[in-house]
């Protein structure tokens, strides 16, 4: 028996369902009573789902997995993983045994889009050209860790004086806080881009500081 899986990782959004595809070619006269199907975590060998003696033995993995019972006899051994979590990420092995056996591994990559960044300025009043200000760009509930880029109004990358921290919450999703420290000019726009490297999703935020609210010192 030859087992086939998709070579590319399966990308699944958090809280959606994912299908880990696995198939085999049944011989003529094949019956499900002959099939021993095991889905397990590749690294730890922990059982995820099994089918033996013509029966679906059910999920051994937080009761969120299911087979496609009507398609098994056709050689479709795919696994449905419901309400995907960050902790589901990793490699899964599909093991099929009839008379002989074969197995193959499929990777699950979990992702969650980042929210539109919120921008804060400190201090946020009595600003004068030449003042040092701190601009914070915050984006929430994404996965995996983000890449953060800062640019000025002319699109010039700002790399100095940037501090970025990423903290995972109880669900494993990241909240990103990136802090840019700059010396104010007469006016300027500062933008941050939070990129999800798996989804290739960009979330943009910007703040524009104009001359209007600024109090210019009197000219000598």
């Amino acid at each position: 028996v030859e087992v086939q899986v998709s070579e590319d990782p399966v990308v699944a959004l958090v809280d959606t369902d994912a299908t880990l595809r696995c198939s085999f070619s049944p011989e003529p006269g094949f019956s499900l009573a002959q099939l021993n199907l095991i889905w397990q975590l590749t690294d730890t060998k922990q059982l995820v789902h099994s089918f033996t003696e013509g029966r679906d033995q059910g999920s051994a993995y937080s009761n969120r997995t299911a087979l496609f019972p009507d398609l098994l006899v056709q050689g479709n051994a795919s696994l449905r993983l419901q309400r995907v979590r960050v902790t589901d990420e990793g490699s899964y092995t599909c093991f099929v045994s009839i008379q002989d056996f074969d197995s193959a591994a499929v990777s699950l990559q979990v992702a969650a889009p980042y929210s539109k960044p919120s921008m804060t300025l400190e201090p946020n009043k009595d600003l004068r050209p030449g003042n040092m200000v701190t601009i914070t760009c915050s984006s929430y509930q994404g996965y995996p860790e983000a890449e953060v880029f800062w640019k000025d109004g002319q699109g010039v990358p700002l790399t100095g004086n940037v501090t970025t921290s990423q903290m995972a919450n109880e669900r494993g999703l990241f909240d990103v806080h990136s802090v840019l420290r700059v010396v104010l000019g007469a006016n300027g726009t500062y933008s941050c881009l939070v990129r999800n490297p798996v989804l290739q999703q960009d979330a943009h935020g910007s703040v524009t500081i104009t001359g209007q609210p600024l109090t210019f010192p009197p000219e000598a």
Epitope: E53, Q57, G58
Partner: antibody, heavy 116, light 106 residues
Framework: QVKLQQSGADLVKPGASVKLSCKAS????????MHWVKQRPGQGLEWIGM????????NYNEKFKNRATLTVDKSSSTAYMQLNSLTSEDSAVYYC?????????WGQGTTVTVSS | DIVLTQSPASLAVSLGQRATITCSAS?????MHWYQQKSGTSPKRWIY???KLASGVPARFSGSGSGTSYSLTISSMEAEDAATYYC?????????FGAGTKLEIK
């Protein structure tokens, strides 16, 4: 005929580990799930976990997940269970059993006594 | 986890009388298996797939049930039937056993 031969009785100290063996014969070892079951004196049967010798896939009772480790040696058709951090509550008879439409064949059991 | 509740916990039956042990599952299961264990020996598979008798099991034993309610019945109690009987399911993970019913001769 199917036979599961388990290792002899063990006397171990609290906090220590024990590794029990179950040698299978009379059938194709790699084709069947092997289960492990605990029975305290005068008590009922408690499922510990199972292993499939062909894939090494394991499934544990949550109660034993962090202390029990199931392994197999395909070349000798032997299943093993290691139990760590033993306490007096682990004093029991431990059985291995082959799964074929129920646990159709059982080992004779290994008595583990935890005492200082 | 599916909890299997056996009743009664113990049962004394006269020779030749009928004995019934029940096993109630906390959620529906597809099959029930039964094991017999005598003191100082390993359990033996006795009834599998709800109603099939294991090899060597006398025809006076029968099993039935579906969903959440299953039973093992001995039509005419004999001395050799005195033992503890356990029900067990593996329709859903994890596999679970009932607490056992001790069957004695009255």
């Amino acid at each position: 005929q199917v036979k599961l031969q388990q290792s002899g009785a063990d006397l171990v100290k609290p906090g220590a580990s024990v590794k029990l063996s179950c040698k299978a014969s009379g059938y194709t070892f790699t084709s069947y799930w092997m289960h492990w079951v605990k029975q305290r004196p005068g008590q009922g049967l408690e499922w510990i976990g199972m292993i499939h010798p062909n894939s090494d896939g394991t499934n544990y009772n949550e109660k034993f997940k962090n202390r029990a480790t199931l392994t197999v040696d395909k070349s000798s058709s032997t299943a093993y269970m290691q139990l760590n951090s033993l306490t007096s509550e682990d004093s029991a008879v431990y059985y291995c059993a082959r799964w074929s439409y129920g646990m159709d064949s059982w080992g004779q059991g290994t008595t583990v006594t935890v005492s200082s | 986890d599916i909890v299997l509740t056996q009743s009664p916990a113990s049962l004394a039956v006269s020779l030749g009388q009928r004995a019934t042990i029940t096993c109630s599952a906390s959620s529906s299961v597809s099959y029930m298996h039964w094991y017999q264990q005598k003191s100082g020996t390993s359990p033996k598979r006795w009834i599998y797939d709800t109603s099939k008798l294991a090899s060597g099991v006398p025809a006076r034993f029968s099993g039935s049930g579906s969903g959440t309610s299953y039973s093992l019945t001995i039509s005419s109690m004999e001395a050799e039937d005195a033992a503890t009987y356990y029900c067990q399911q593996w329709s859903r993970n994890p596999l679970t056993f009932g607490a056992g019913t001790k069957l004695e001769i009255k």
